[in-house]
C-alpha cells in the first residue's frame, strides 16, 4: 500500500489556445486530469488501473502551481494504491479548459482539451522526486513525481506492513525495509522478551520488563544467585533452596536445638565457668563466694554457719564475728562453760558428761548436728546432683530433681529419647546428643516418619523451564510436563531447537 504523488509546478500556454488551435474565450481556465495505470509500451486509452484524479481550475493560460494550491486542490496530487507497487507505470496528464464551473467530463465539450501528455517507465519507491518537463508545439508542462509507502508500509514495493508499538504484544519501531527494530531493553522476534538485569541468573531469575531480575521460588538477591533456607529453619543456611544447614552450635531438622547453650546464652553469672551438657542443658561451676544454679547468689562468710553452740554470726568487712550464747566462748563459740546440768543439748539431744563434769558432749538425734545439736543436717552441701540437678532436703535423706533429659538418683544418666519409640511406621531411632533422629523407611518422611510419601523423584528439581514434575509411583522416576514451547525428557529444549 502506497501513494503515487504528482507535483504540478508550471504550465505554459502563452497564446491561450486549445489543442485544436482555437483560442479560449476570454482565456484558457486550466485544470488537469491525471490517469495512472499499469505499464504499457504504447500508452493507450482505457481504465486508469492505478487510479485517477482531477484538479480544480489552477490558473489561466500560463501559471505556476503552488504547493497545496488554494481553490480546494492538493498539490502534490495523491494517487493512493493498496497493492504491491510493481515498479513500472504509465501516466497520462491532460490539461483542460473549463468554460463554466462544472468540470465533470460529461459537462465539457470534447474540444476543450488543451494538451495531453503520456509517459511510461520504471519507478522505484523512494523519497526523491523525479523532475520532468513535457513540451508540445503550443504548451509546456513542468512537474515532478514519486512513489512513497503509506503509513506502516515499508520495503521496495510497500508490501511490508509494520506498525510501531510499545505494549504487551511488542516493543519496537520499524526500519525503512520494514524489519522490526527493538526498543532498548527488548529482544526476540517481535521484541516481546525483556532483556533482564545484567548478570541475572539464567535459571533462577527472569524478568517482565527490561533491567529487572525477579527470582524464581527458592532464590533471592539482586541476581537471584542466593538460595532461601527452609521456612522452618532457625539457625541455618542453604546451598540449594529450602535447605537448613545448621550454624555451629545448633542441631535438629530446623537447626532449632541449642547445642552450645553456654555460648549463645551465657547463663553463668559472676565469672562462673559454663559447661554444655546436652541440648539446652548446662552446668555452672561457681567461683568461691557464689552459689545457685547460675552462680547468681553471693555467699556471705556467715553462710557456712561457722558459729557453734547457737552462736549468732555477724558479717564484717574482714570476715565474720560470732556472738556466743551464755556459757560459751571462743572464736566459734566452741568452748563451753556449761555442764549437763545446764541442759545444753537442743532438739532432743542427750547430754554426756566428760572430764569429771568439767565439760560435756551432746549425742544428736538424726537430722541434727553441731556440738549442741543446734544445726539441721543439710545433705545437699556436697552438691551431689550431676548435670545441673537441684538438690532437695527430704527429712533424713536428700533427693535430686533432675533437668529434662537426665535421670538417676543423682541425675547421672542421660535419658534415651528413643526409649518411648517415637519413630512411626517402623522408623529407626538414633539417640544423638542434640536429640533424637528418625531414619524413615521408603515411603515415609517427616521428623517422626509420620508423613506417608512416595519416593520423591522430583526432589532434585530435574525439570527445566518451569515444567511441572510428577513422580511415577510405579517406577519411582520423574516425569516432566513441559510448558508450551519446550520439549525433551526434562523440558530442556525449546521447540525448534533439536538436541545438539
Amino acid at each position: 500500500s502506497g501513494v503515487f504523488q504528482l507535483q504540478l509546478q508550471e504550465f505554459v500556454n502563452e497564446r491561450g489556445v486549445l489543442a485544436s488551435g482555437r483560442p479560449c474565450e476570454p482565456g484558457c481556465r486550466t485544470f488537469f486530469r491525471v490517469c495512472l495505470k499499469h505499464f504499457q509500451a504504447v500508452v493507450s486509452p482505457g481504465p486508469c488501473t492505478f487510479g485517477s484524479v482531477s484538479t480544480p481550475v489552477l490558473g489561466t493560460n500560463s501559471f505556476a502551481v503552488r504547493d497545496d494550491s488554494s481553490g480546494g486542490g492538493r498539490n502534490p496530487l495523491q494517487l493512493p494504491f493498496n497493492f504491491t507497487w510493481p515498479g513500472t507505470f504509465s501516466l497520462i496528464i491532460e490539461a483542460w479548459h473549463a468554460p463554466g464551473d462544472d468540470l465533470r467530463p460529461e459537462a465539457l465539450p470534447p474540444d476543450a482539451l488543451i494538451s495531453k501528455i503520456a509517459i511510461q517507465g520504471s519507478l522505484a519507491v523512494g523519497q526523491n522526486w523525479l523532475l520532468d518537463e513535457q513540451t508540445s508545439t503550443l504548451t509546456r508542462l513542468r512537474y515532478s513525481y514519486r512513489v512513497i509507502c503509506s503509513d506502516n508500509y515499508y520495503g521496495d514495493n510497500c508490501s511490508r506492513l509494520c506498525k510501531k508499538r510499545n505494549d504487551h504484544f511488542g516493543h519496537y519501531v520499524c526500519q525503512p525495509d520494514g524489519n522490526l527494530s527493538c526498543l532498548p531493553g527488548w529482544t526476540g522476534e517481535y521484541c516481546q522478551q525483556p532483556i533482564c538485569l545484567s548478570g541475572c541468573h539464567e535459571q533462577n531469575g527472569y524478568c517482565s520488563k527490561p533491567a529487572e531480575c525477579l527470582c524464581r521460588p527458592g532464590w533471592q538477591g539482586r541476581l537471584c544467585n542466593e538460595c532461601i533456607p527452609h521456612n522452618g529453619c532457625r539457625h541455618g543456611t542453604c546451598s540449594t533452596p529450602w535447605q537448613c544447614t545448621c550454624d555451629e552450635g545448633w542441631g535438629g531438622l530446623f537447626c532449632d536445638q541449642d547445642l552450645n547453650y553456654c555460648t549463645h546464652h551465657s547463663p553463668c553469672k559472676n565469672g562462673a565457668t559454663c559447661s554444655n551438657s546436652g541440648q539446652r542443658s548446662y552446668t555452672c561451676t561457681c567461683r568461691p563466694g557464689y552459689t545457685g544454679v547460675d552462680c547468681e547468689l553471693e555467699l556471705s562468710e556467715c553462710d557456712s554457719n561457722p558459729c557453734r553452740n547457737g552462736g549468732s554470726c555477724k558479717d564484717q568487712e574482714d570476715g565474720y564475728h560470732c556472738l556466743c550464747p551464755p556459757g560459751y566462748y571462743g572464736l566459734h563459740c566452741e568452748h563451753s562453760t556449761l555442764s549437763c546440768a545446764d541442759s545444753p543439748c537442743f532438739n532432743g539431744g542427750s547430754c554426756r558428761e566428760r572430764n569429771q563434769g568439767a565439760s560435756y558432749a551432746c549425742e544428736c538425734p538424726p537430722n541434727f548436728t553441731g556440738s549442741n545439736c543446734e544445726k539441721k543436717v543439710d545433705r545437699c552441701t556436697s552438691n551431689p546432683c550431676a548435670n545441673g540437678g537441684q538438690c532437695l532436703n527430704r527429712g533424713p535423706s536428700r533427693m535430686c530433681r533432675c533437668r529434662p533429659g537426665f535421670t538417676g538418683t543423682y541425675c547421672e544418666r542421660h535419658v534415651s529419647d528413643c526409649a518411648r519409640n517415637p519413630c512411626a511406621h517402623g522408623g529407626t531411632c538414633h539417640d544423638l546428643e542434640s536429640g533424637l533422629m528418625c531414619t524413615c523407611p521408603a515411603g515415609f518422611s517427616g521428623r517422626r516418619c509420620e508423613v506417608r510419601t512416595s519416593i520423591d523423584a522430583c526432589a532434585s528439581s530435574p525439570c527445566f523451564n518451569r515444567a511441572t514434575c510428577y513422580t511415577d509411583l510405579s517406577t519411582d522416576t520423574f516425569v516432566c510436563n513441559c510448558p508450551y514451547g519446550f520439549v525433551g525428557s526434562r523440558c530442556e529444549f525449546p521447540v525448534g531447537l533439536p538436541p545438539s
Partner: antibody, heavy 118, light 107 residues
Framework: EVQLVESGGGLVQPGGSLRLSCAAS????????MAWVRQAPGKGLEWVAT????????SYRDSVKGRFTISRDNAKNSLYLQMNSLRAEDTAVYYC???????????WGQGTLVTVSS | DIQMTQSPSSLSASVGDRVTITCRAS??????LAWYQQKPGKAPKLLIY???NLADGVPSRFSGSGSGTDFTLTISSLQPEDFATYYC?????????FGQGTKLEIK
C-alpha cells in the same frame, strides 16, 4: 522461639513520614530475607516490600515505589520501613514477616498500626 | 498481577465438621501456594506451604491439595480454636498476591 516485634506506627498527616522498625530474635537474622505486609482496616493482606538477606536487595509493590524504602541492619537484627509522602490509602496494620516475594511468609510480628489522616 | 479468588467468602460450621475452602488463581502458579490463618486482632499464621506441606506445629487436621490454578484447604474435624479467617497466597509470580479471605464462623 522466633519473635518479630514492630514499632514506630502512629497517626500521621497525608504527605508526612514515618519509620517502622522490627526487632527480630530466635533465628539467625542475617541468613533470611524479610518482608513487610500490610492489612487495611477490615481488608485483606497486601505485600508491601521485601529485602534479601546478604545483599539487601529491595523489591516494592508498584503503589509504594519511590515513597517507601525497606532496609535492614544485620548487626542489630533489625528491619526497617521508611515511609514518605504518606497517603490515606496507606492506612493499615503493618506486619514484619520472615519471607520473600517468592516464598511463604513463615513468621509474623504482632503488627503496628499506621493511620494517615488530616 | 495474578488474581487469587477464594470461595466462599464466609461460611458457618460446627465443631467436628469437615470444612473445605477453595482458592483459584488467574493463571498457573504450579504448587507455589500457601495458606494462612488469622484470628481477630492477631497476626496471620502460616498453616500450609507449597500447596500441601504442613508448617511446623500445625495440627494434622489441616491439609492442602491442588495444583495449577485450583487449590483447596481442608479441615477434617473443626475444633473451637479453628474459627478464624483463612487466606491463600501465591508466590509463583511477582508480585505475591493474597486471596480476599474466607471467614469461618461458628454455626
Amino acid at each position: 522461639e522466633v519473635q518479630l516485634v514492630e514499632s514506630g506506627g502512629g497517626l500521621v498527616q497525608p504527605g508526612g513520614s514515618l519509620r517502622l522498625s522490627c526487632a527480630a530474635s530466635g533465628f539467625t537474622f542475617r541468613h533470611f530475607p524479610m518482608a513487610w505486609v500490610r492489612q487495611a482496616p477490615g481488608k485483606g493482606l497486601e505485600w508491601v516490600a521485601t529485602i534479601s538477606s546478604s545483599d539487601a536487595w529491595p523489591s516494592y509493590r508498584d503503589s509504594v515505589k519511590g515513597r517507601f524504602t525497606i532496609s535492614r541492619d544485620n548487626a542489630k537484627n533489625s528491619l526497617y520501613l521508611q515511609m514518605n509522602s504518606l497517603r490515606a490509602e496507606d492506612t493499615a496494620v503493618y506486619y514484619c514477616s520472615r519471607g520473600y516475594y517468592n516464598s511463604p511468609f513463615a513468621y509474623w510480628g504482632q503488627g503496628t498500626l499506621v493511620t494517615v489522616s488530616s | 498481577d495474578i488474581q487469587m479468588t477464594q470461595s466462599p467468602s464466609s461460611l458457618s460450621a460446627s465443631v467436628g465438621d469437615r470444612v473445605t475452602i477453595t482458592c483459584r488463581a488467574s493463571e498457573d502458579i504450579y504448587s507455589n501456594l500457601a495458606w494462612y490463618q488469622q484470628k481477630p486482632g492477631k497476626a496471620p499464621k502460616l498453616l500450609i506451604y507449597d500447596t500441601n506441606n504442613l508448617a511446623d506445629g500445625v495440627p494434622s487436621r489441616f491439609s492442602g491439595s491442588g495444583s495449577g490454578t485450583d487449590f483447596t484447604l481442608t479441615i477434617s474435624s473443626l475444633q473451637p480454636e479453628d474459627f478464624a479467617t483463612y487466606y491463600c497466597q501465591q508466590y509463583n509470580n511477582y508480585p505475591p498476591t493474597f486471596g480476599q479471605g474466607t471467614k469461618l464462623e461458628i454455626k
